[in-house]
């Protein structure tokens, strides 16, 4: 999996009026890193993880881009012409990501309430658009503001690409991300649904990277997907994910149902436990 | 114009706590960091620490954390600074100072000379 | 903490001069160093961001250079209102720390 870093910025504007506030969010080989509210802009790392690496650095620089970037954004969204009444938004993703060959990319995205409008491959300059004509409009405009000057806008963009790796090597460098392998905690829980029927719940914590197979089986045969239901896989703000699996069994066939982790290679199984029932809450309606 | 406003002088006596004040008037006073420094007479600049009005989040300089409370009133745009125990060590010119980008102090008080005597 | 050692003490100069400060981290510390003058009795005032960003209504005649460690504020024709203590500070690590100055005086 590639290294990546990933800025997530959205400013909005009301009746037409470009608000003064912006949201910057970055994340880092997945999780999240920096935050620039809007009050007061302060890059803070999110969470335990990312503020031991570093220890008692200001983020000064890291604050100083995110606020130029937020003007920016304020600035593009101040260009785009027949903006309805009501609350309205201006995000820009920008990713780039350093692979295990040591190639990268980078790339850029445009969304207008929500809804992409405006592509760039920040390596090759090409840009595309959805076909919608509400989209083309859009990208039209933006991208004939972002090309006023065109010198400033070549700059602009090679300038952004460097950056974002450049910054990308700086975290890899200090140690922020190291390629590491922390292996999930396993916990089978079970609780009533109806009558005759329990739910059982397979919670996967604290494990990195962030892909797992998390799955139900009956007598080591893993049950259809339209039988279980998953949860996303989350940060939980310590540098680690957490995920989980849920099916709805019938009471007294426990001993048959085992939860299937898989992750970086290694796996186990993890049966239901007997006994009387923990909690008195379904998954599902 | 921004203005920071702060008394000119306070005699303190060893051991009784004094509230330093600095008046904020012509910007958005909840919209900045406010940063304390201290100047020893003859002697450079430290810094003490910085508050946000918006929230009264604080950041302090590990070495005043027993020494100094940082607090804001928003309705009267007031920063203030209390010095907790003051010795003659605490004998100095206190300077508060609004932030204007990540770290840099564009407006100062002209400073509270504050005298520890008995 | 970063210590910023500030160099000379004292610098000596007549009106019209060239005059370069010098202010030297104990780590590197990136572009996040500003510089203050304070005159005598009076409080500090912005010069120069993050090594040689310029501050609007100040003169042209104050620049700053450098990065990582090294870092130099010039006042490329010196006047006598140009006397008074001059502050490097950096911004890069907690706590933010201030060198400890160096005093600009006339021949």
């Known amino acids: 999996e590639p290294h990546s870093l990933r800025y997530n910025l959205t400013v909005l504007s009301w009746d037409g009026s470009v608000q003064s506030g912006f949201l910057t969010e970055v994340h880092l080989d997945g999780q999240p890193f920096l935050r620039c509210d809007r009050q007061k802009c302060r890059a803070k790392p999110q969470g335990q993880w990312a503020e031991d690496v570093l220890g008692n650095k200001t983020w000064d620089r890291e604050t100083r881009d995110l606020t130029g970037n937020g003007k920016d954004l304020r600035m593009t969204l101040a260009h785009i012409k027949d903006q309805k009444e009501g609350l309205h938004s201006l995000q820009e993703i920008r990713v780039c990501e350093i692979h295990e060959d040591n190639s990268t990319r980078s790339s850029q995205h445009f969304y207008y309430d929500g809804e992409l409008f405006l592509s760039q491959n920040l390596e090759t300059k090409e840009w595309t658009m959805p076909q919608s004509s509400r989209a083309q409009t859009l990208a039209m405009n933006v991208r004939n503001f972002l090309k006023e000057d065109a010198m400033k806008t070549k700059t602009h963009y090679h300038a952004m690409h460097a950056d974002c790796l450049q910054e990308l090597r700086r975290y890899l460098k200090s140690g922020v991300v190291l390629r590491r392998t922390v292996p999930p905690m396993v916990n089978v829980t079970r609780s009533e649904a109806s009558e005759g029927n329990i739910t059982v719940t397979c919670r996967a914590s604290g494990f990195y990277p962030w892909n797992i197979t998390l799955s139900w089986r009956q007598d080591g045969v893993s049950l259809s997907h339209d039988t279980q239901q998953w949860g996303d896989v989350l940060p939980d703000g310590n540098g680690t994910y957490q995920t989980w699996v849920a099916t709805r069994i019938c009471q007294g066939e426990e001993q048959r149902f085992t939860c299937y982790m898989e992750h970086s290679g290694n796996h186990s199984t993890h049966p239901v436990p007997s006994g009387k029932v923990l909690v008195l809450q379904s998954h599902w309606q | 114009q921004v203005q920071l406003q702060q008394p000119g002088a306070e005699l303190v006596r060893p051991g009784a706590s004094v509230k330093l004040s600095c008046k904020a008037s012509?910007?958005?006073?909840?919209?900045?960091?406010m940063n304390w420094m201290k100047q020893r007479p003859g002697q450079g600049l430290e810094w003490i620490g910085m508050i946000h009005p918006s929230d009264s989040e604080t950041r302090l300089n590990q070495k005043f954390k027993d020494k100094a409370t940082l607090t804001v009133d928003k309705s009267s745009s007031t920063a203030y600074m209390q010095l907790n125990s003051p010795t003659s060590e605490d004998s100095a010119v206190y300077y508060c100072?609004?932030?204007?980008?990540?770290?840099?102090?564009?407006?100062w008080g002209q400073g509270t000379s504050v005298t520890v005597s008995s | 903490d970063i210590l910023l050692t500030q160099s000379p003490a004292i610098l000596s100069v007549s009106p019209g001069a060239r005059v370069s400060f010098s202010c030297r981290a104990s780590?590197?510390?990136?572009?996040?160093i500003h510089w203050y003058q304070q005159r005598t009795n009076g409080s500090p005032r912005l010069l120069i961001k993050?090594?040689?960003e310029s501050i609007s209504g100040i003169p042209s005649r104050f620049s700053g250079s450098g990065s990582g460690t090294d870092f130099t504020l010039s006042i490329n024709s010196v006047e006598s209102e140009d006397i008074a203590d001059y502050y490097c500070q950096q911004s890069n690590y907690w706590p933010l720390t201030f060198g400890a100055g160096t005093k600009l005086e006339l021949k």
């Open positions: 780590q590197n510390i990136d572009t996040s």
């Open positions: 012509g910007y958005s006073f909840t919209s900045y960091w």
């Open positions: 100072a609004r932030e204007m980008g990540p770290y840099t102090l564009d407006y």
């Open positions: 993050y090594a040689s």
